[in-house]
Interface confidence: medium
């Protein structure tokens, strides 16, 4: 590239900003498009209109959108069609000086393919590299009076369509994802169509979490949540793990002979056994239950720790309704309602002379339940959470796995019966019996608890094994896909989620190291600056206007404070 | 260069009228909003009034508002401030300005003397 | 009407000293809708208009020399010349651009030692 044009990349020099320009027509390359542009530098573009004037028909107040134009050379801050540093009129408000924003003409020149657009297609964008006058005069070139970018050449045909378009984005098919994404991020078309995007390509969007409102409240809830965000958090973290570990493996040992408690784990599945173990003492844990047992301490401490971190998190935490639907807090309170319940009947067992409180199915229902704490590792494992979030996202392709496996089941159970129905060495008494040889086989476990006999059920038997190695393949390679994605989603640095704080809220980034409390220092452009007055009354017409951080949108109209939005992915800790 | 040659100051009287003009170059004035801001010798800056690039909203400040008229003609890049019943607190240089509620660029101003 | 108070009304300094020149407003200058200070710096050399040097409080216009830099929000604000050059002498403004009518302070004089 020549070394005028790269000279582009910097801001002009003051004097060079507003040299005028009589109209003229560059050479055109190739097949490049033309310019037939008046074109005279501008002043700075205007800031939009203070959050005081509104706009009414007929009264004489200055609309929002209306500032003060200008910006770089060929163009102007289109002051009457809201091309200005100020922000556009939300669409209920039609900018009253629409006609007047900027019918001439302009070029854009591509690493040497020219783009021709009216500048009012730009002005509908006024947030954005193009849309901007001030952000896009460093890319122009006087001489040449065009605009000019390195940049990829196929997606700025997309690029362009955004504008033309009124804000639809396409990707190229010739453009990869990732060069797309970039030319989206370089052209500041915000994060709207930077999700527009991601969701058309199949990315799942990110919600955002508020934090707790009060300071105290906040530190405890950021404490029990984020372990990254601190030591003592990663303390707790730690803790918790550990204690579900204990918890878990406490679950496994008082299952082996020499501790079983012979009440819940009966020897024999004699009638008698099952009578006599509702006063048993025998075995080896006589008086398993009772409350001086080791197993029963270590749970109770078990316990302990998860009710306190349970309750603690939801009394610090900022929506309770939000918290009860989490179905993370769900696996907790299922975690621990075995252990009460237990309890209860324990305690209920003493006071009724030793009678059984309740029916050892149902207790042994219920402390199995037990078991489902290990899931409460996934709140601090990323591979648990990537598993969690790959079956979220193939619930389709799984329906479909048990769909295609429920009509084999039918299909060879019935054909495996009927072809071995006339031997009578033969295991399948009946369809259903047969059941569970098909899912079996067509899983291609093959036990063999179970198998025919006759040629034609052994040949009933290989197609049901061919079908279920193809049927089964079928929707695997979806899921492997969402699988990828939600790892490389992690690895790749994603996992760096914003705390946010929104309008006022100050911007709390979080890395994989800590959360660090920073102020916010987006850019602001001119083109914010935006009020209404009406009559001697000053009020807002627009709505909270969301900041945009990372690949995700944060909204907290609620309250003011520091801090009071976070990004809903956590940081884990690596497992 | 973006240019703002203001005219049409003078001495009057008080109760008189004056009409200002600003011609601008450099830039596409007809999409650019405009201002009047004046300066009195040793005192504070003072906005006076505003108005959109189509010309058809404008704003002004209370201590003038219903004496001054601000318009603007896109054709001949000019803006205009039609100030009548002029009392001697108007003195002061006024300069023609982009912007409406941050101005990117000034005009040198035209002196306006009101005294009898 | 919002009020703005400017202080001090002149400061001398040395060239390459800090100096910071504060601006108060009668009530908070920060738009509801987007959470941004409505506020504006302007310097005025001798025999010469004013410039824009910085808006919403904090943002460069274009074309400003890195060592003006402003900050503040709600009320209070702040111009900061980090390191006076000679060509600084002149009289800072500050403006609110939140509500008509647009009010300016009274100035403060920067003089070069």
């Known amino acids: 590239m020549d070394e005028r044009l790269s000279l582009l990349r910097s801001p002009p020099p003051p004097s060079a900003r507003h040299r005028a320009h009589p109209p003229q027509r560059p050479a055109s390359s190739g097949g490049a498009h033309t310019l037939v542009n008046h074109g005279y530098a501008e002043p700075a573009a205007g800031r939009e209109l203070p959050p005081d004037m509104t706009v009414v028909p007929g009264d004489h107040l200055l609309e929002p959108e209306v500032a003060d134009g200008g910006g770089a050379p060929p163009q102007g801050g289109c002051g009457g069609g809201g091309c200005d540093r100020y922000e556009p009129l939300p669409p209920s408000l039609p900018a009253a000086g629409e006609q007047d924003c900027c019918g001439e003409r302009v070029v854009i020149n591509i690493s040497g393919l020219r783009f021709e657009t009216q500048l009012k297609t730009l002005c509908q964008f006024p947030e954005t590299l193009l849309g901007d006058p001030k952000r896009r005069m460093r890319y122009f070139d006087p001489l040449r009076n065009e605009y000019f970018f390195d940049r990829n050449r196929p997606s700025f045909d997309a690029i362009l369509y955004y504008y033309q378009s009124g804000g639809r984005i396409r990707r190229p098919v010739n453009v990869p994802i990732d060069i797309f994404s970039e030319e989206i991020r370089f052209y500041q078309l915000g994060e709207e169509a930077m999700e527009k995007f991601r969701e058309d390509e199949g990315f799942l969007r990110e919600e955002e979490r508020p934090l707790p409102r009060r300071d105290f409240q906040r530190q405890v809830w950021l404490l029990f949540e984020y372990p990254e965000s601190s030591g003592p958090a990663r303390g707790i973290a730690i803790v918790s793990v550990l204690v579900i570990l204990i918890s878990i493996v406490i679950f496994c040992l008082e299952t082996l002979p020499e501790f079983r408690d012979e009440k819940d784990y009966p020897a024999s599945t004699s009638q008698d056994s099952f009578e006599a173990a509702g006063n048993s003492t025998s075995g080896s844990r006589a008086g398993a239950s009772s409350f001086s047992d080791p197993f029963f301490v270590v749970e109770t401490l078990c316990i302990i720790w998860f009710s306190f971190e349970l309750l603690v998190r939801f009394f610090a935490c900022p929506s309770k309704a939000t918290f009860s639907r989490n179905i993370m807090n769900l696996i907790d309170i299922v975690a621990i309602i075995p252990y009460f319940i237990t309890l209860g009947t324990e305690l209920a067992e003493r006071q009724g002379n030793g009678q059984q409180a309740m029916s050892l199915a149902i207790l042994r229902v219920i402390r199995l339940v037990r078991v489902f704490r290990i899931f409460k590792l996934s709140r601090h494992s990323k591979g648990l959470q990537i598993l969690g979030q790959t079956l979220k996202a193939s619930m389709r392709e799984l329906g479909l796995l048990i769909f295609f496996l429920f009509i084999g089941v039918i299909l060879f159970s019935s054909a495996v019966y009927f072809a071995e129905a006339d031997d009578p060495t033969s295991g399948f008494s009946s369809i259903p019996d047969a059941f569970w040889w098909a899912v079996v086989t067509m899983t291609t476990v093959g036990y063999g608890d179970m198998h025919p006999v006759t040629i034609g059920g052994k040949i009933v038997g290989s197609l049901c094994a061919i079908a279920g190695v193809l049927t089964i393949a079928l929707p695997v390679p979806v899921i492997v896909s969402n699988f990828n994605y939600f790892y490389h989603r992690e690895t790749e640095g994603e996992e760096q989620s914003q705390y946010m704080h929104v309008g006022s809220c100050q911007h709390l980034s979080s890395s994989a190291e800590e959360l660090r409390k920073a102020r916010s220092n987006s850019t602001l452009s001119k083109s914010e600056y935006m009020v209404i007055e009406e009559g001697g009354m000053n009020h807002s017409a627009f709505p909270q206007t969301p900041f945009k951080t990372g690949n995700s949108t944060a909204t907290c109209t609620t309250n003011n404070n520091p801090n009071s939005c976070v990004n809903i992915k956590k940081i884990f800790t690596d497992v | 260069q973006v240019q703002l040659q203001e005219s049409g100051g003078g001495l009057v009287q008080p109760g008189g009228s004056l009409r200002l003009s600003c011609a601008a170059s450099?830039?596409?004035?007809?999409?650019?909003?405009m201002s009047w801001v004046r300066q009195a010798p040793g005192k504070e800056v003072e906005w006076v009034s505003s108005?959109?690039?189509?010309?058809?909203?404008?704003n002004y400040r209370d201590s003038v508002k219903g004496r001054f008229t601000i318009s603007r003609d896109n054709v001949k890049n000019t803006l205009y401030l039609q100030m009548n019943s002029l009392k001697p607190e108007d003195t002061a240089f006024y300069h023609c300005?982009?912007?409406?509620?941050?101005?990117?660029?000034w005009g040198q101003g035209t002196q306006v003397t009101v005294s009898s | 009407d919002i009020q703005m108070t400017q202080s001090p009304s002149s400061v001398t300094a040395s060239v390459g000293e800090k100096v910071t020149i504060n601006c108060k407003s009668s009530?908070?200058?920060?738009?509801?809708?987007?959470?941004?200070?409505?506020l504006n710096w302007y310097q005025q050399r001798p025999g010469q208009s004013p410039r824009l040097l910085i808006y919403?409080?904090?943002t460069q216009e274009l074309g400003i020399p890195d060592r003006f830099s402003g900050s503040g929000s709600t009320t209070d604000f702040t111009l900061t010349i980090s390191s006076v050059q000679p060509e600084d002498a002149a009289v800072y403004y500050c403006?609110?651009?939140?509500?008509?009518?647009?009010?300016f302070g009274s100035g403060t004089r920067l003089e070069i030692k």
């Open positions: 300005v982009t912007g409406i509620v941050a101005y990117d660029y």
């Open positions: 450099g830039f596409t004035f007809s999409i650019n909003g």
């Open positions: 108005i959109n690039s189509g010309g058809e909203i404008t």
């Open positions: 009530q908070s200058v920060v738009s509801a809708s987007n959470q941004k200070s409505y």
């Open positions: 919403y409080a904090s």
């Open positions: 403006q609110q651009a939140y509500s008509a009518p647009y009010n």
